[in-house]
Amino acid sequence: TLNSVLNSNAIKNLPPPLGGAAGHPGSAVSAAPGILYPGGNKYQTIDNYQPYPCAEDEECGTDEYCASPTRGGDAGVQICLACRKRRKRCMRHAMCCPGNYCKNGICVSSDQNHFRGEIEETITESFGNDHSTLDGYSRRTTLSSKMYHTKGQEGSVCLRSSDCASGLCCARHFWSKICKPVLKEGQVCTKHRRKGSHGLEIFQRCYCGEGLSCRIQKDHHQASNSSRLHTCQRH
């Protein structure tokens, strides 16, 4: 469907089947140059480049990240920008193209053999480092899920929840995303009160499991707004 016609590297950003694993089936891919749009079940070439607005990285394609288009970061709308290739400068993992991550301000290859130890080291280095939270929105690790042939177990690095095994979701942990357990009845959950507030979480919780929703715990109704405890409760 509407994959970002509206971005600077839209050909790379076509949803599968062009990319492989997923997507709307049966799409015919145009070989013409230009930006491609899978509308209905056909791709169509678009002449013009248009940016795509975003509030967080997840709104962008896997080959993009969300940021202000100007270095100074004006108050205007943020847009999806093309990811940075290997050896390019970065401020967080989402800026680096799939298969790479941000280490010491440079996009480096997330070679499967060395990846786990290095990313943990990078997370430790970047924690508390101002420029790693430059835009104040959520971080999406743009590590290629193709690296993982089996569904991620708890603690595995992921891109989206479909990369994780059943009962797990993909949630932020520092500036990366890992598979965490979907919340069970009675567990504390996060209720986002305002737009964009979820972008401030360093340790993001999963959503509540099937048949549950995140609601104020009965005995906490009298508490002040800031201390209200939300738990997963039956509908």
Epitope: T1, L2, N3, S4, V5, L6, P15, P16, A21, A22, G23, H24, P25, P38, G39, Q50, Y52, P53, C54, A55, E56, E58, E59, V77, S138, R160, S161, S162, C169, C170, A171, R172, H192, K195, H198, Q204, C206, Y207
Partner: antibody, heavy 118, light 107 residues
Framework: EVQLLESGGGLVQPGGSLRLSCAAS????????NHWVRQAPGKGLEWVST????????YYADSVKGRFTISRDNSKNTLYLQMNSLRAEDTAVYYC???????????WGQGTLVTVSS | DIQMTQSPSSLSASVGDRVTITCRAT??????LNWYQQKPGKAPKLLIY???NRPSGVPSRFSGSGSGIDFTLTISSLQPEDFATYYC?????????FGQGTKVEIK
Amino acid sequence: EVQLLESGGGLVQPGGSLRLSCAASGFTFSSYWNHWVRQAPGKGLEWVSTIGPSGTSTYYADSVKGRFTISRDNSKNTLYLQMNSLRAEDTAVYYCAESFRSRYFDYWGQGTLVTVSS
Amino acid sequence: DIQMTQSPSSLSASVGDRVTITCRATQSIRSFLNWYQQKPGKAPKLLIYGQHNRPSGVPSRFSGSGSGIDFTLTISSLQPEDFATYYCQQYYDWPLTFGQGTKVEIK
């Protein structure tokens, strides 16, 4: 073929709850953004809520914030809208929609009618 | 929130007519505007995205223009299947908002 099929609509009293479901098929559900858009009888379209592919990003219209909860189960290819504290003004046909991008409504279901009345 | 206002609310036209619908935003939304078509009893359908781009399968008689605050949907030669209600939608910022709709009726 992409298909979105809503269910769960019906008649409910003010203050009551209802849970809508949207079963998706014909595409890889877990890669796409999903939305609820409603249309009151004889009125225009109103965006209600949006959820990201992983379920971690959610957005709500002010008119439903704190009352409605959007969620998804990627293992079941299903989108949900839990509606609590329903009001007469929530009466509408509720459409689910999907898109590769967050702010479009590319494919739509046929809708399910929710009537809030005493 | 960004409000979207369409005009006219309804119009009557004949097959073959050129029809113009306008949509105005309360602030600049750059080119971040979509148009949808909805026929009675049916779900809406994406008609124009990103201000003037047509999804595959949408006839070339539909075109979009404008930027910033004022936008236009033009149907160059109205066909019988075009009688419907048309909505604009901004995607510059959350919350996503629609115009109130323009109903195109047969004269």
